[in-house]
């Protein structure tokens, strides 16, 4: 029995006799040594890293990566042009912005060049793998005697992101958190002027433009309260 590789036009190429000859009539046939899984993340839609655990190979092996986009103008098979290395062994591939097409099915194929029949083809939805940069330029405005408004910026299309704000006082043991939609502002209606508050924000590419599960890093924190400058009580900028 032969295995197949899904080619860019959606047809299959016959490659080799890869399984035990009992496959698939034997319900528990196991293939030859599997290749490591490839995990891809798109960083702020500026570049993408697709990585694998090179140490899972029984001996050091420079695995090769090819990719293409299914059913699109970009369906030509591409070789990785920028490998990432771990201890001088390939462990990933970096793709630049012009090579990223979020809303086309991304097909990535890992192969052992010493045994070309040993390959694995994965399919990925890149719009679910976007990780934005952390929010920046956090600012606090005092809207009234007891109300604060937190604002921030993202280096991305704002409507594509949702946010999570966390805040706490010096008296709190844990963070209070609040989800915020694409509007990237948050109001705290009741502030105790005797306490010092810390705020931080992270963002996620969800739900309008994708369904990413991974959040950005947390922003640098910003502080407000009894220890902050008394000079301008109406505007407090980011504290690194």
């Amino acid at each position: 029995l032969n295995t197949t590789i899904l080619t860019p036009n959606g047809n299959e190429d016959t490659t080799a006799d890869f399984f035990l000859t009992t496959m698939p009539t034997d319900s528990l046939s196991v293939s030859t040594l599997p290749l490591p899984e490839v995990q891809c993340f798109v960083f702020n839609v500026e570049y993408m890293n697709c990585t694998w655990n090179s140490s899972s190979e029984p001996q050091p092996t420079n695995l090769t990566l090819h990719y293409w986009y299914k059913n699109s103008d970009n369906d030509k098979v591409q070789k990785c042009s920028h490998y990432l290395f771990s201890e001088e062994i390939t462990s990933g591939c970096q793709l630049q912005k012009k090579e990223i097409h979020l809303y086309q099915t991304f097909v990535v194929q890992l192969q052992d060049p010493r045994e070309p029949r040993r390959q694995a083809t994965q399919m990925l939805k890149l719009q679910n793998l976007v990780i934005p940069w952390a929010p920046e330029n956090l600012t606090l405005h005092k809207l009234s005697e007891s109300q604060l408004e937190l604002n921030w910026n993202n280096r991305f299309l704002n409507h594509c992101l949702e946010h999570l704000v966390q805040y706490r006082t010096d008296w709190d043991h844990s963070w209070t958190e609040q989800s915020v939609d694409y509007r990237h502002k948050f109001s705290l209606p009741s502030v105790d002027g005797q306490k010092r508050y810390t705020f931080r924000v992270r963002s996620r590419f969800n739900p309008l433009c994708g369904s990413a599960q991974h959040w950005s890093e947390w922003s640098h924190p910003i502080h407000w309260g009894s220890n902050t400058s008394k000079e301008n009580p109406f505007l407090f900028a980011l504290e690194a």
Partner: nanobody
Framework: QVQLVESGGGLVQAGGSLRLFCATS????????MGWFRQAPGREREFVAC???????FYADSVKGRFTFSRDSAKNTVYLQMNSLQPEDTAVYYC????????????????????WGQGTQVTVSS
């Protein structure tokens, strides 16, 4: 060990529908990528559809828009709903499973799957 048992195959007229079932015993499917493949007489095994345990689903061009892959983790079962069946869909359909670390891993290559069922015959008459 994962054991996979397919069912739901049969004889159907062109334009008809069938729903294939793939039940697993021995392990939960919660961390497995799953796939459906088919093999017609005298032809190579062919990718039909696959999914990741994170919920991303993919299809071969030949079945896209007609077939729907789904899974019920509570029942440890995956399904392949096949509509608008054509004679060229006639084949033995196999379910396959691959343990994966990442929620986004979905395989279209048959050699990536460690576990296979015995298959269920689907025949579409014209």
């Amino acid at each position: 060990q994962v054991q996979l048992v397919e069912s739901g195959g049969g004889l159907v007229q062109a334009g008809g529908s069938l729903r294939l079932f793939c039940a697993t015993s021995g392990r939960t499917l919660s961390r497995y990528a799953m796939g459906w493949f088919r093999q017609a007489p005298g032809r190579e095994r062919e990718f039909v559809a696959c999914d990741s345990w994170g919920g991303d689903t993919f299809y071969a061009d030949s079945v896209k828009g007609r077939f729907t892959f789904s899974r019920d983790s509570a029942k440890n079962t995956v399904y392949l709903q096949m509509n608008s069946l054509q004679p060229e869909d006639t084949a033995v359909y196999y379910c396959a499973a691959a343990p994966t670390s990442f929620a986004t891993t979905a395989y279209s290559s048959s050699n990536s799957y460690a576990y296979w069922g015995q298959g269920t015959q689907v025949t579409v008459s014209s």
